[in-house]
Amino acid sequence: SHTLPVRLLRPSDDVQKIVEELQSLSKMLLKDVEEEKGVLVSQNYTLPCLSPDAQPPNNIHSPAIRAYLKTIRQLDNKSVIDEIIEHLDKLIFQDAPETNISVPTDTHECKRFILTISQQFSECMDLALKSLTSGAQQATT
């Protein structure tokens, strides 16, 4: 398994800007993915989001989220996905083994995978932003 390069920790306001951008991009991706009619979300796929045993901004499961988005990129060439991956790269602060995700082979299952992960990713970025802003409020009180 590959390991991602070590990066310097970013100030939490930098992280917040990145997550705000990711939140916006995730909405764009989901809007486009939802154009594909007749596709239902699947219970078979779960995107890791926030780690309960870490403090913001280190609680975002960026390496795993990035691995799922890279899998979607194998199935879909929307350029917003490249941009999302670039932003997720900035949130990976230490060595982390790359998560291996098996790509669905069935056409309809591909669509379900993309829709499900896109929806969960959008929800995850909402949660991540809330956790960052509430963490920042707690730090100032």
């Epitope: 764009m28 809007k31 486009d32 993915v33 154009e35 594909e36 194998q74 199935l75 929307k78 669509k111």
Partner: antibody, heavy 124, light 110 residues
Framework: QSQLVESGGGRVQPGGSLRLSCAAS?????????ICWVRQAPGKGLEWIVC?????????YYAPWAKGRFTISKDNSKNTVYLQMNSLRAEDTATYFC???????????????WGQGTQVTVSS | AFQLTQSPSSLSASVGDRVTITCQAS??????LAWYQQKPGKPPKLLIY???KLASGVPSRFSGSGSGTDYTLTISSLQPEDFATYYC??????????WGFGTGTKVTVK
Amino acid sequence: QSQLVESGGGRVQPGGSLRLSCAASGFSFSANYWICWVRQAPGKGLEWIVCIYIGSRADTYYAPWAKGRFTISKDNSKNTVYLQMNSLRAEDTATYFCARFSSGIYDLDRFFLWGQGTQVTVSS
Amino acid sequence: AFQLTQSPSSLSASVGDRVTITCQASQSIDSWLAWYQQKPGKPPKLLIYQASKLASGVPSRFSGSGSGTDYTLTISSLQPEDFATYYCQTYYGGGHIGWGFGTGTKVTVK
């Protein structure tokens, strides 16, 4: 029946401009595909010019040589993509095709669609 | 800059021959590769997409294979209507790769 129809070609003098249109019929502009312009000079190969994404953002990708002189745009209400070509040269003489490509690997071949092409001749 | 290198540029073959055309990308394109057949005065006709999927209505004598940077189009038994020019194309659509065509392979009668 889905189709793409190019128009706007013709003869133009070197240094002149043309605007080509690619009208979609039988389908509407929605997310999940790209519309591209490709050209083919007489007796030569296919040459990609530019693509525009049909979706929530109008992302564009230009061939390096096309940046500056060529501009792609779209009008969703008219289901049409345009190619504005400026400072035309003799070597721009070609048949210009527009084509639709999928943005996903699912149901892919329903997204590959080409027009018949429009002829552009740059000559004094 | 990204490049797709197609070879050979031309080949002569007889009806019934097995024909192989290759396409090499200067960086990985994750199977975002299509093969087309083109005849004079006509737009290209899709044969293969996503490196190995046969387009609807295309005879099974055409097949595609490959991944990463190296791809192949094979015609298992050349038919009279197969004499034409063939192109590979990437439709990766983003990043630093985008789009592009191979230089073409003209298949003529031996």
